[in-house]
């Protein structure tokens, strides 16, 4: 059992091409940093894996369609939004996100767990920030993205709690 750090999340929901007045920010302390994650802030556009059956990102060939800076081929800073489960470990998911160029990995919990979060253990996958958020929050974000809403998340280090029991997948 180890201590766990919460994550402050500032999430923006923006309908593209409508201007800044349509941006809604939502501040909460609803995430927890992974046990092997760097304890540092990170921000980016949330990007789920391509394809309806790829939410768990357990296939090593999983891809992400990353938005680019307007008028260029330069990718914006982004965070992989991945669902827990599917037969692979947290480390597998986070490492894949890192390999694809993500600045961080946001893992959301299984369906049916509502807003429950757990401390993730992901030895070896230590290059990018990794947090877990609840299923309700993750599903809301995912559905927004699927409707064409761009969702940006700013993650900051919260408070220390613990000890909790670690989970690897």
């Amino acid at each position: 059992a180890e201590a766990v750090w919460t994550a402050y999340l500032n999430v923006s929901w923006r309908v593209p091409h409508t201007g800044v007045n349509r941006t809604v920010w939502e501040l909460s302390e609803e995430g927890v940093y992974g046990q092997d994650s760097p304890l540092e802030p990170v921000a980016g556009v949330l990007v789920p894996p391509d394809g309806p059956g790829a939410l768990n990102a357990c296939n090593p060939h999983t891809n992400f369609t990353v938005p680019t800076v307007w008028g260029s081929t330069v990718q914006v800073s982004w965070l992989a939004l991945i669902q827990r489960g599917g037969g692979c470990t947290f480390a597998d998911k986070i490492h894949l996100a890192y390999e694809r160029g993500a600045s961080g990995a946001v893992i959301f919990n299984f369906p049916g767990t509502r807003n429950e979060v757990i401390p993730m253990s992901h030895p070896g996958a230590v290059d990018i920030v990794a947090i877990m958020i609840g299923n309700l929050k993750g599903t809301k974000i995912l559905q927004s993205i699927q409707r064409g809403i761009q969702v940006t998340m700013v993650i900051e280090v919260g408070k220390k709690h613990g000890p909790w029991v670690n989970h690897y997948s």
Epitope: H17, G19, A43, W70, V76
Partner: nanobody, 118 residues
Framework: QVQLQESGGGLVQAGGSLRLSCAAS????????MGWYRQAPGKEREFVAA???????YYADSVKGRFTISRDNAKNTVYLQMNSLKPEDTAVYYC????????????WGQGTQVTVSS
């Protein structure tokens, strides 16, 4: 209404340096990203560099390692330090404010001319 005032352009010899500035005034929402684009004669406007609210910067491959973008949030100003300039950098440089996120069409300034002679 937003006003973007670019300055710092001019004529410089190849290998030289220039520093462009862009001061934004009017309605500026905390949370806008800023950047620079350029347009050479007879060519389309192209992305040069951008900076988000923190310290994340983005560069076109053609300027990476030579140009540096920075911002002063207190002054609502963005800068573009251009070193090792080449004749192909000659263009009108436009300041950009991304009111709708980095991925969407920005609001442009009037532009400042940069000419690099060989």
């Amino acid at each position: 209404q937003v006003q973007l005032q670019e300055s710092g352009g001019g004529l410089v010899q190849a290998g030289g340096s220039l520093r462009l500035s862009c001061a934004a005034s009017g309605y500026i929402f905390y949370g806008v990203h800023m950047g620079w684009y350029r347009q050479a004669p007879g060519k389309e406007r192209e992305f040069v560099a951008a900076i988000d609210l923190g310290t994340t910067t983005y560069y076109a491959d053609s300027v990476k390692g030579r140009f540096t973008i920075s911002r002063d949030n207190a002054k609502n100003t963005v800068y573009l330090q251009m070193n090792s300039l080449k004749p192909e950098d000659t263009a009108v440089y436009y300041c950009a404010v991304y009111f709708d996120g980095l991925t969407n069409l920005p609001y442009w300034g009037q532009g400042t001319q940069v000419t690099v002679s060989s």
